[in-house]
């Protein structure tokens, strides 16, 4: 047994359309067949769950229909995309990975990705 390490980028800038993508990579100590990935947002010492998905290794990652997250998995790497972000959503987004099955259970928590969101300036009215 050894601890599970989770890596994610330190900083990501959301696009002008409010979309941010980052990779969450974990060093699996065991042969997990079922993995749960959760994105947590930490801002002003408050923690909220942004989204979560459980997937079987080799299968696609599926979030709930109303989730603001989408993602794909490849081996021990998860590509996460968060949409609909606004300036007020700027904060630290933490990737949490749990190896659910088979036992033993493993938990790994990344250091977080600081996502900066800048609301686009409204287009100036045209005089034409």
């Amino acid at each position: 047994c050894k601890a599970m390490h989770v890596a994610q980028p330190a900083v990501v800038l959301a696009s002008s359309r409010g979309i941010a993508s980052f990779v969450c990579e974990y060093a699996s100590p065991g042969k997990a067949t079922e993995v749960r990935v959760t994105v947590l947002r930490q801002a002003d010492s408050q923690v909220t769950e942004v989204c979560a998905a459980t997937y079987m290794m080799g299968n696609e990652l599926t979030f709930l229909d109303d989730s603001i997250c989408t993602g794909t998995s490849s081996g021990n790497q998860v590509n996460l995309t968060i949409q609909g972000l606004r300036a007020m959503d700027t904060g630290l987004y933490i990737c949490k990975v749990e190896l659910m099955y088979p036992p033993p259970y493993y938990l790994g928590i990344g250091n977080g990705t600081q996502i900066y969101v800048i609301d686009p300036e409204p287009c100036p009215d045209s005089d034409f």
């Epitope: 047994c1 050894k2 601890a3 599970m4 390490h5 079922e34 749960r36 959760t38 947590l40 923690v47 769950e49 979560a52 459980t54 949490k96 749990e98 659910m100 099955y101 036992p103 033993p104 259970y105 493993y106 938990l107 790994g108 928590i109």
Partner: antibody, heavy 118, light 108 residues
Framework: QVQLVESGGGVVQPGSSLRLSCAAS????????MHWVRQAPGKGLEWVAV????????HYADSVKGRFTTSRDNSKNTLHLQMNSLRAEDTAVYFC???????????WGQGTLVTVSS | EIVLTQSPGTLSLSPGERATLSCRAS???????LAWYQQKPGQAPRLLIY???SRATGIPDRFSGSGSGTDFTLTISRLEPEDFAVYYC?????????FGPGTKVDIK
């Protein structure tokens, strides 16, 4: 605020069964793993079992494996621990605890005492 | 399973003094997955520190945690009367989740 209330403890004979319950309120129950931890009189804390999120995955301490079963009803915000083939060494205060977003046990119930004695 | 050892078993100190509690793991523990709890007689445990060094909500800043790998420390900078209790470390990164045997901090 988060509240966890255990019930179902009591005095039973060795070999018998008991079902503990934990009523949860003040948070989104299905978003958290739920744990059982016990404490024998005058002793330290011992983790007993966990049931994750939708209830499909459970893990147990070796000392209770095959005898104890945990379950949850997310529609009723309730956690259960079915204890069979009870032994004297199962005598303890049983706590339910919420697994926080970061995995630590961030909220605990007040505990319910189970005494196994002939 | 990961075995946690705490030392000393009992720490006798006076209010205002500094308390240093140690927790050692039998194998490396992710610092993200190490917690400290306080328990007073007849009460449930209370989370103090998670992730080795992050204070739980409402915990005074006289409590601090540090360490990595196999060695972790809980420090209480100036003991208040309400701090005399039993303190447990716990790892929650790998099942079975395990607690240390506890350190009792009592009044000298």
């Amino acid at each position: 605020q988060v509240q966890l209330v255990e019930s179902g403890g009591g005095v039973v004979q060795p070999g018998s069964s008991l079902r503990l319950s934990c009523a949860a309120s003040g948070f989104t129950f299905s978003s958290h793993g739920m744990h059982w931890v016990r404490q024998a009189p005058g002793k330290g804390l011992e983790w007993v079992a966990v049931i994750w999120y939708d209830g499909s995955n459970k893990h147990y301490a070796d000392s209770v494996k095959g005898r104890f079963t945990t379950s949850r009803d997310n529609s009723k915000n309730t956690l259960h621990l079915q204890m069979n083939s009870l032994r004297a060494e199962d005598t303890a205060v049983y706590f339910c605890a919420r697994g926080g977003y970061f995995g630590c046990f961030d909220s605990w119930g007040q505990g319910t005492l189970v005494t196994v004695s002939s | 399973e990961i075995v946690l050892t705490q030392s000393p078993g009992t720490l006798s100190l006076s209010p205002g003094e500094r308390a240093t509690l140690s927790c050692r793991a039998s194998q490396s523990v992710s610092s993200s997955c190490l917690a400290w709890y306080q328990q007073k007689p007849g009460q449930a445990p209370r989370l103090l520190i998670y992730g080795a060094s992050s204070r739980a909500t409402g915990i005074p800043d006289r409590f601090s945690g540090s360490g990595s790998g196999t060695d972790f420390t809980l420090t209480i900078s100036r003991l208040e009367p309400e701090d005399f209790a039993v303190y447990y470390c716990q790892q929650y990164g790998i099942s079975p989740f395990t607690f240390g045997p506890g350190t009792k901090v009592d009044i000298k």
